[in-house]
């Protein structure tokens, strides 16, 4: 219950919004963990950076990387080249000493690439408004900084 | 073109169960969630849940839970829905419905009329 | 669960009008909204989804807007084919919630 979805294709990027109340939760790092089992603890995958004020610095896991947009509320996790064993249930964590607050509940369901013949049943080809782009990728919801951009432009 | 083909009308006693199917050609079927829908006669739409074929598995709204049970059969492309213990409250419209990668469901079955009467 | 409010469930118009037909969800979903459209004895059909993203095929006067919790769906100029009922779906959150639909009619 009080679970967002998000769909992506195997061997593709899934890209996973998680908005939050940016002044309820500053000066919070974040993290997304793994749900293991219904009721069993939450697996740490990956953290944002340790100084908040780098949070929208890209940190990476394997194939799981995070940034937060501490301004605009939302923390996106990315997941490279989505495996079958990716799916499942997960969190978005908001973290303060040794607790941590699940921002958002999230189940990641894998499908199959269309254009991969292994198991595709008929051919799929993306209709007149959507690019393979548009169809494989869940953007996030609000604008979050990328990596290597500073939060403010210097001022002179 | 993608057509979701909903099997026919059935009339069934209560305590009964019952099991639909929904054949979905002309797209890759395990490369999108099947869902299906409750609409009772005059009345508003109601999520059941959804099989992601490629997977097996299943995401339930609680409220059907005991209710329905959602297969699929990749070889014919077909999705299923079993609904056991019926009663007259189970008398509906059942639609099986593709969700697409924007999310919202782009394609819908005609429909699966579900009468419970002894 | 989230609730979808659909403020009217039905609707006197005119056929060249401009239609605005409101959702209200409980809590914020962040735009991930869909409207349809559904006719006597037929299936719904997808409009809109992602609150403002027309669907292929989709006549240009439609239209969605909105944010947070509150969403319109717009007619431009009703046409005698856009006489049907129109509901709205959250996929925000499971389990995925519609509203209880609003239904146009002639005056």
């Known amino acids: 219950h009080n679970t967002t979805v998000f769909q992506g294709v195997e061997g593709q990027s899934l890209q996973v919004s998680c908005p939050y109340d940016s002044m309820k939760h500053w000066g919070r790092r974040k993290a997304w963990c793994r749900q293991l089992g219904e009721k069993g603890p939450c697996q740490r995958v990956v953290s944002t950076h340790n100084l908040w004020l780098l949070s929208f610095l890209r940190r990476r896991n394997g194939s799981t990387a995070i940034t937060d947009d501490t301004l605009g509320g939302t923390l996106t996790i990315t997941l490279r080249n989505l495996q079958p064993h990716d799916a499942g249930f997960y969190q978005c964590q908001s973290l303060h000493g040794s607790e941590a607050d699940t921002l958002r509940k999230v189940l990641v369901e894998v499908l199959a690439d269309p254009l991969d013949h292994r198991d595709a049943g008929d051919l799929w080809v993306p209709g007149e408004s959507e690019s393979f782009e548009d169809a494989h990728v869940e953007h996030s919801i609000s604008r979050s900084l990328l990596e290597g951009e500073i939060p403010f432009p210097p001022t002179s | 073109e993608v057509q979701l083909q909903q099997s026919g009308p059935e009339l069934v006693k209560p305590g009964a169960s019952v099991k639909m199917s929904c054949k979905a050609p002309?797209?890759?079927?395990?490369?999108?969630?099947m869902n299906w829908v409750k609409q009772k006669p005059g009345q508003g739409l109601e999520w059941i849940g959804y099989?992601?074929?490629?997977?097996?598995?299943?995401n339930y709204n609680e409220k059907f839970k005991d209710k329905a049970t959602l297969t699929s059969d990749k070889s014919s492309s077909t999705a299923y829905m079993e609904l056991r213990s019926l009663t007259s409250e189970d008398s509906a419209v059942y639609f099986c419905?593709?969700?697409?990668?924007?999310?919202?469901?782009?394609?819908w079955g005609q429909g699966t009329t579900l009468t419970v009467s002894s | 669960d989230i609730q979808m409010t659909q403020s009217s469930s039905s609707f006197s118009v005119s056929l060249g009008d401009r239609v605005t037909i409101t959702c209200k969800a409980s809590?914020?979903?962040?735009?991930?909204l869909a409207w349809y459209q559904q006719k006597p004895g037929n299936a719904p059909r997808l409009l809109i989804s992602?609150?403002?993203s027309l669907e292929t095929g989709v006549p240009s006067r439609f239209s969605g807007s909105g944010s947070g919790k509150d969403y319109t769906l717009s007619i431009t100029s009703l046409q005698t084919e856009d006489v049907a009922t129109y509901s709205c779906?959250?996929?925000?959150?499971?389990?995925?919630?519609f509203g209880g639909g609003t239904k146009l009619e002639i005056k």
């Open positions: 419905a593709r969700s697409s990668y924007r999310y919202g469901f782009d394609y």
């Open positions: 002309g797209y890759s079927f395990t490369s999108y969630l």
């Open positions: 099989i992601n074929p490629y997977s097996a598995g299943s």
């Open positions: 809590e914020d979903i962040y735009n991930r």
């Open positions: 992602g609150a403002t």
């Open positions: 779906q959250q996929y925000w959150s499971t389990p995925w919630t």
